[in-house]
Interface confidence: low
């Protein structure tokens, strides 16, 4: 059952070429651009993180004996994944709250590479997607999702971890990026902006969308998240942009209607199981893919990012609820929880469809500048 409230086909970048980002962070950086310090989003910055880093929010991996077969997405330990240290890409804030976890914030000090050196790596996320420069790769087959339609029971944990709202997923949600590229879903979370300020992490030709959903997966080749961190293809994230539409999105409403219960940082509630696939676009065949990193500390690299071409539609009220209900630590609203786009540094974004041909209204005679690498290489 797919949501009817999605654009039938909404090419990313259609009609959005060169649109200025309200935060002034995205100046359509070229692939050669060096990392830049993230501009502090403002007084609503999100302070530290407690539980999981985002997709990133990877789980602290519990001993298997604690709950056999269950992948826990709790606090991801700070891991120093390999990477070439560069100038700071993001700022972070460290403090201690009774444990040894690193705490960080968007737009604060010290820089994220001091929290985790991997944050200064060369192949970081998010990135600006330029359909014209994407390499059409016919080997990228439609994504396969199995077991994503969950029954109401058992209920799922919905948590405000101080830097996002995260839904922990039960075992059994399987996803395949292609033959032999199989993953298990662990958790999903969202990134958003503030009133009148979009907050997606990825951008398309410099255009930032209102919000973005990330569904984080662990490769079946690994039993634990900490084993997969920094390993090519160890983690995979499905990402979709959320846009404003005329109707309420019933699937998202099942989560958004519960946000007030977890408005406080660190709080959580239980929600009935739902159709997780209904939170994603209905077209699993058209997407962009590249290798990047977690977008929050520990910023581990080797993450396979799949960004849907189709967007998901939420009502204006729903987008407002998302951006205006939750609170982070220190009496600050949980808003603008996205990282600045990072340089590609030579990476090629692949497309499962000829994006350069049909997704940008600017190119009358598109030229494919990049060649496709065989999927899975």
């Amino acid at each position: 059952q797919r949501l009817p409230r999605m654009q039938e086909d909404s090419p990313l970048g259609g009609g959005s070429s060169g649109e200025d980002d309200p935060l002034g962070e995205e100046d359509l950086p070229s692939e050669e651009d060096s990392p830049r310090e993230e501009d502090p989003p403002g007084e609503e910055d999100l302070p530290g993180e407690e539980d999981l880093p985002g997709e990133e929010d990877l789980p602290e991996v519990k001993p298997k004996s604690e709950e056999e077969g269950s992948l826990k997405l709790e606090d991801l330990p700070t891991v120093e994944a390999p990477g070439d240290p560069q100038e700071p890409q993001n700022n972070a804030h460290r403090d201690k709250e009774g444990d040894d976890q690193s705490h960080w914030r968007y737009g604060g000090d010290p820089p994220w590479p001091r929290v985790s050196p991997a944050c200064a790596g060369r192949f970081q996320s998010p990135v600006d997607i330029r359909p014209q420069l994407a390499a059409f790769c016919p080997a990228l087959r439609p994504l396969e999702l199995l077991g994503f339609q969950l029954p109401p029971l058992p209920e799922l944990r919905l948590r405000n971890n101080g830097h996002s709202v995260q839904l922990t997923l039960p075992p059994g949600l399987e996803m395949a990026l292609g033959p032999g590229r199989e993953y298990r879903a662990l958790q999903l979370h969202l990134h958003w902006g503030a009133a009148g300020r979009p907050g997606s992490e990825h951008t398309v030709e410099g255009h930032r969308f209102p919000a973005e959903i990330h569904v984080v997966h662990l490769s079946t080749a690994f039993a634990r998240v900490d084993e997969a961190l920094g390993r090519p293809g160890g983690l995979a994230v499905l990402a979709a942009f959320l846009e404003e539409g005329p109707e309420e999105n019933s699937a998202y409403e099942q989560l958004l209607s519960r946000l007030e219960e977890i408005a406080e940082e660190g709080s959580e509630t239980q929600v009935p199981g739902l159709d997780i696939s209904a939170l994603l676009p209905s077209d699993f065949s058209r997407y962009f893919q590249y290798e990047g990193s977690l977008t929050t500390p520990p910023c581990a690299q080797g993450v396979i990012w799949t960004v849907f071409n189709q967007t998901v539609m939420l009502s204006a009220k729903q987008l407002h609820t998302l951006s205006d209900t939750l609170w982070g630590p220190g009496d600050s609203r949980l808003q603008l929880n996205f990282r600045a786009t990072q340089p590609l540094n030579g990476r090629v974004i692949e497309a499962s469809f000829p994006a350069g041909v049909d997704s940008s209204p600017r190119a009358a005679e598109p030229v494919q500048l990049n060649s496709c690498l065989a999927a899975g290489d």
């Epitope: 519960r258 007030e260 408005a263 406080e264 709080s267 959580e268």
Partner: antibody
Framework: EVQLLESGGGLVQPGGSLRLSCAAS????????MTWVRQAPGKGLEWVGI???????WYADSVKGRFTISRDNSKNTLYLQMNSLRAEDTAVYYC???????????????WGQGTLVTVSS | DIQMTQSPSFLSASVGDRVTITCQAS???????LSWYQQKPGKAPKLLIY???NLPSGVPSRFSGSGSGTDFTLTISSLQCEDFATYYC????????????FGGGTKVEIK
């Protein structure tokens, strides 16, 4: 320093009405859930009701339909309108602020000093 | 409705003693829905523990909270003179039908 000051308590006959106020200083109440709690003489604490930061309200079964919680953000004041009062409503009434902004979680700090409501004929 | 059963109701202890108070919920609740309060005669309650295990600033570290699901505990590691008071747990769940309730209280008296 955040302070909450209740007022409006007193003696009222059964079936009567009373409106309690809780004035806040040192903080903007509009960002916080606020709760009312009462304590009958010599008894324990009893939760009465709560208003969320989005002005949704929930009540204990014992007062549902009789009590109404509201707030006036311009006055930074919380209210408890009590109608159809009964003898068992006699108690010290406390208002309290959610310890953190936004949500409904059960952590309240600080509390007002309380105001005594006596329902008797 | 949810019920919070607190025990013991009364507790006699001496300065320096380790004191443990338990609170049992009639149904599973999230740790973020459980807090503990201290009340002295004629005074308003004071928040001691929130989210089951967290101490607000200004609360002495001899107070600690633990537990999850239905069983929660407040521990005073070394009782001080100023700790003789009544302690209440507050637990519940914030859902479409928000419900919360206090435990019956535990009065800690000087032995």
């Amino acid at each position: 320093e955040v302070q909450l000051l209740e007022s409006g308590g007193g003696l009222v006959q059964p079936g009567g009405s009373l409106r309690l106020s809780c004035a806040a200083s040192g903080i903007d109440l509009s960002n916080y859930a606020m709760t009312w709690v009462r304590q009958a003489p010599g008894k324990g604490l009893e939760w009465v009701g709560i208003i969320s930061s989005n002005d949704k309200t929930w009540y204990a079964d014992s007062v549902k339909g009789r009590f109404t919680i509201s707030r006036d953000n311009s006055k930074n004041t919380l209210y408890l309108q009590m109608n159809s009062l009964r003898a068992e409503d006699t108690a010290v009434y406390y208002c309290a602020k959610a310890a953190m902004p936004g949500g409904l979680k059960n952590a309240f700090d600080p509390w007002g000093q309380g105001t005594l409501v006596t329902v008797s004929s | 409705d949810i019920q919070m059963t607190q025990s013991p109701s009364f507790l006699s202890a001496s300065v320096g003693d380790r004191v443990t108070i338990t609170c049992q919920a009639s149904q599973t609740i999230g740790g973020s829905d459980l807090s503990w309060y201290q009340q002295k005669p004629g005074k308003a309650p004071k928040l001691l523990i929130y989210y089951a295990t967290n101490l607000p600033s200004g609360v002495p570290s001899r107070f600690s909270g633990s537990g999850s699901g239905t069983d929660f505990t407040l521990t005073i590691s070394s009782l001080q003179c100023e700790d003789f008071a009544t302690y209440y747990c507050l637990g519940g769940y914030a859902a479409a039908s928000y419900r919360t309730a206090f435990g019956g209280g535990t009065k800690v008296e000087i032995k």
